[in-house]
């Protein structure tokens, strides 16, 4: 065979990934690999991830002679050990006036009265703890409730008998019930006064309120 067909182990170099070829015999060679590579021709990237140092659920991503940690959203840093301040990153993390409190590995919301849930978006059902009298209807409000009374009942909790039921107000007067004590309040038409609007008054005095 001609000299041009002679095998020269390192020409061209079989070493890849920056490896350096060294001829060790007539037909043999050895590759000196750059850090992070291995194999007879440096063809293999060494996996640097076994027993990696990524913490708090960080995922190891192999590199060349190194690795990176892909951190969950609440962690950051080289090894996912630095807490992300979600309160800074998300100024509106807590709704309805709630206060954001950063914590290691997350955050919490301190909700104002009447709101609950992770982000204070849930209106607390105040009717769950309300004591509206049976037969009345509870209406949930923010940090409060109100009771809708059936006919004949009055008071904040519908626990009082409605004094207006007996029509105590005369002469077309308006009858209202005091929600605190269940007593009636007559709003007298022009020309009448008294608790029941039964008394005449002088002209010029109008719309008297009388409590009973």
């Amino acid at each position: 065979a001609g000299s041009d067909s002679l095998y020269v182990p390192c020409a061209p170099s079989p070493c890849v990934n920056g490896g350096t070829c060294r001829q060790t015999g007539d037909f043999t060679f050895e590759c000196n690999c750059l850090p992070g590579f291995e194999g007879s021709t440096c063809e293999r990237n060494i996996d640097d991830c076994p027993n990696h140092r990524c913490q708090n659920g960080g995922v190891c991503v192999d590199g060349v002679n190194t690795y990176n940690c892909r951190c969950p959203p609440q962690w950051t840093g080289q090894f996912c050990t630095e807490d992300v301040d979600e309160c800074l990153l998300q100024p509106n993390a807590c709704q309805n006036g709630g206060t954001c409190a950063n914590r290691n590995g997350g955050y919490g919301c301190v909700c104002v009265n009447g709101w609950s849930g992770d982000d204070c978006s849930e209106n607390i059902d105040d009717c769950a703890f309300a004591s509206c009298t049976p037969g009345s209807t509870c209406i949930d409000r923010v940090a409060s409730f109100s009771c809708m009374c059936p006919e004949g009942k009055a008071g904040l909790l519908c626990h009082l008998d409605d004094a207006c039921i007996s029509n105590p107000c005369h002469k077309g007067a308006l009858c209202d019930t005091n929600p605190l004590n269940g007593q009636y309040i007559c709003t007298c038409p022009q020309g009448y006064k008294g608790a029941d609007c039964t008394e005449d008054v002088d002209e010029g005095n109008s719309h008297h309120h009388h409590h009973h």
Partner: antibody, heavy 117, light 112 residues
Framework: EVQLVQSGAEVKKPGESLKISCKGS????????IHWVRQMPGKGPEWTGY????????KFNEKFKGQATISVDKSSTTAYLQWSSLKASDTAMYYC??????????WGQGTLVTVSS | DVVMTQSPLSLPVTLGQPASISCRSS???????????LHWFQQRPGQSPRLLIY???NRFSGVPDRFSGSGSGTDFTLKISRVEAEDVGVYYC?????????FGGGTKVEIK
């Protein structure tokens, strides 16, 4: 508050075995590796190795491979550094540490190991 | 392993005066993620090391603002703007960019 509390000082003879401990508290123990750092008298600290409490996997500084073992007991949130046959050259202060903002952010108070015949 | 060289070995300082410690690495400490993992520790006599500065220039919580860090690549500096009596001790730099993590040999700060 993150705390690492180590066992007390030990005086041993060459060839004896030893196990020192580091109890972690104030954080989720399984989520963080525990490192062991050696500091020989009058010298700077040297990273020895670490253990992953969740899996029990360990990684060592090549310089210290085969000289000691690291183990963990998750139930008591405690990591251990153990020698089967001590040498005089093992005399040093041994610290456990945990990562945080920087490498080795939280440290134990140290355990002084003295090996002398 | 990456070799961390600190200078000076010993630093006598006057109270209230500034102090500066240098740390050089045998190779660049810029990680493939773009960050530089160079940290500074203080070790007071008879105590455990304490983190002062992480990632070149970030002060750890509770560290007085008289401590500051700077540098890039292979050259880093820790500065104390006005030395106080409680600053006496040995200061170490540490790199965690390359495996294994390696410390500098230390600089002893003492009062003149």
């Amino acid at each position: 508050e993150v705390q690492l509390v180590q066992s007390g000082a030990e005086v041993k003879k060459p060839g004896e075995s030893l196990k020192i401990s580091c109890k972690g508290s104030g954080y989720t123990f399984s989520n963080y590796v525990i490192h062991w750092v050696r500091q020989m008298p009058g010298k700077g600290p040297e990273w020895t190795g670490y253990i992953i409490p969740g899996s029990g996997g360990t990684k060592f500084n090549e310089k210290f491979k085969g000289q000691a073992t690291i183990s963990v007991d998750k139930s008591s949130t405690t990591a251990y550094l153990q020698w089967s046959s001590l040498k005089a050259s093992d005399t040093a202060m041994y610290y456990c540490a945990r990562d945080g903002a920087g490498s080795f952010t939280y440290w134990g108070q140290g355990t002084l190991v003295t090996v002398s015949s | 392993d990456v070799v961390m060289t600190q200078s000076p070995l010993s630093l006598p300082v006057t109270l209230g005066q500034p102090a500066s410690i240098s740390c050089r690495s045998s190779q660049s400490l810029v990680h493939s993620d773009g960050n530089t993992y160079l940290h500074w520790f203080q070790q007071r006599p008879g105590q455990s090391p304490r983190l002062l500065i992480y990632r070149i220039s970030n002060r750890f919580s509770g560290v007085p603002d008289r401590f500051s860090g700077s540098g890039s690549g292979t050259d880093f500096t820790l500065k104390i703007s006005r030395v106080e009596a409680e600053d006496v001790g040995v200061y170490y730099c540490l790199q965690s960019t390359h495996f294994p993590d390696t410390f500098g040999g230390g600089t002893k700060v003492e009062i003149k």
